[in-house]
């Protein structure tokens, strides 16, 4: 799905509704772990105002948190601004409002700099039908399969979802 | 090894527009990501945008809007359009070959620079 890195045809409010994340991939594998920073779950998403609301589940001291996200946007069309442990640069990878999402973010945090990719679909019972585009991307973005993390249905915020 | 060579380089005046080009030659470059960085007189080389092989990309904030990085495999070309330019853009700008997104990373190859100059 070369070139398809924007926002998708009918704007941002096709991104609206529910969400479910299937895999995470990282340069640095403690942001994913299990209680790393990034260890989060896409519950919903919203748009306005050409801003991305998000909320999503992170879970803390045994229990998931929902917490809501904005992502601004900026003069780039596929790029948002998120605050969120520190400082991220949003893109949107490929996009396919009906079916999945992938993004990645460019993390700053103090002086330190890595890269997150998030792959999340609509249907979980597809997740696998969208898995190897989400491999391709992490390849070329420079993010290896062993950097991949598949999240599973006995995942602590699966639970949480509804 | 990948050769680089960067050109479009040139003296603009404040609010104008250059196009950057930078030709890879030797090795394929096109399953690589391709850089813009760009080094100020006693400043450190700093970030500037950067596409992959399948033209994702990654700006850093202050030329975001205002620059567009982009690609063609058949060329083996990478460039990077300049717009709304202003006098802090004035560097030298070299294009590299890198493993992916991340500023800095893993770069294999630098090109030798093209000055800008952004001046009333």
């Known amino acids: 799905q070369e070139g398809n890195h924007e926002e998708p045809q009918g704007g941002l409010e096709e991104l609206s509704g529910r969400w479910h994340s299937v895999a995470l991939a990282s340069n640095k594998s403690d942001l994913i772990k299990p209680w790393g920073h990034f260890r989060v779950f896409i519950h919903s998403m919203s748009a306005k105002d050409g801003n991305l609301h998000g909320d999503i589940l992170i879970p803390q001291d045994g229990q998931c948190e929902k917490v809501s996200l904005t992502a601004f946007k900026t003069a780039t069309s596929n790029k948002f601004d998120l605050e969120y442990w520190g400082h991220n640069d949003l893109y949107l990878a490929e996009v396919d409002p009906k079916s999945y999402l992938i993004l990645y973010m460019i993390n700053q945090y103090n002086d330190d700099t890595s890269l997150v990719a998030h792959l999340m679909v609509r249907d979980l019972s597809r997740q696998q039908d969208f898995l190897p585009a989400f491999e391709s991307v992490c390849e070329d973005i420079g993010l290896h399969k062993d950097q991949i993390v598949v999240l599973s249905d006995d995942d602590r915020c699966q639970g949480s979802r509804d | 090894a990948v050769q680089l060579v960067e050109s479009g380089g040139g003296l603009v005046q404040p609010g104008g527009s250059l196009r950057l080009s930078c030709v890879a030659s030797?090795?394929?470059?096109?399953?690589?990501?391709m850089g813009w960085y760009r080094q100020a007189p006693g400043n450190e080389r700093e970030f500037v945008a950067v596409?992959?092989?399948?033209?994702?990309?990654h700006y850093a904030n202050s030329v975001s809007g205002r620059f567009t990085i982009s690609r063609d495999h058949a060329k083996d070309t990478a460039y990077l359009q300049m717009n709304s330019l202003k006098p802090e853009d004035t560097a030298v700008y070299y294009c590299?070959?890198?493993?992916?997104?991340?500023?800095?990373?893993?770069?294999?190859?630098w090109g030798t620079g093209t000055q800008v100059t952004v001046s009333s």
């Open positions: 030797g090795s394929s470059s096109r399953n690589y990501a």
């Open positions: 596409i992959t092989s399948r033209g994702y990309t």
């Open positions: 590299n070959t890198q493993a992916g997104l991340l500023p800095f990373m893993t770069v294999y190859d």
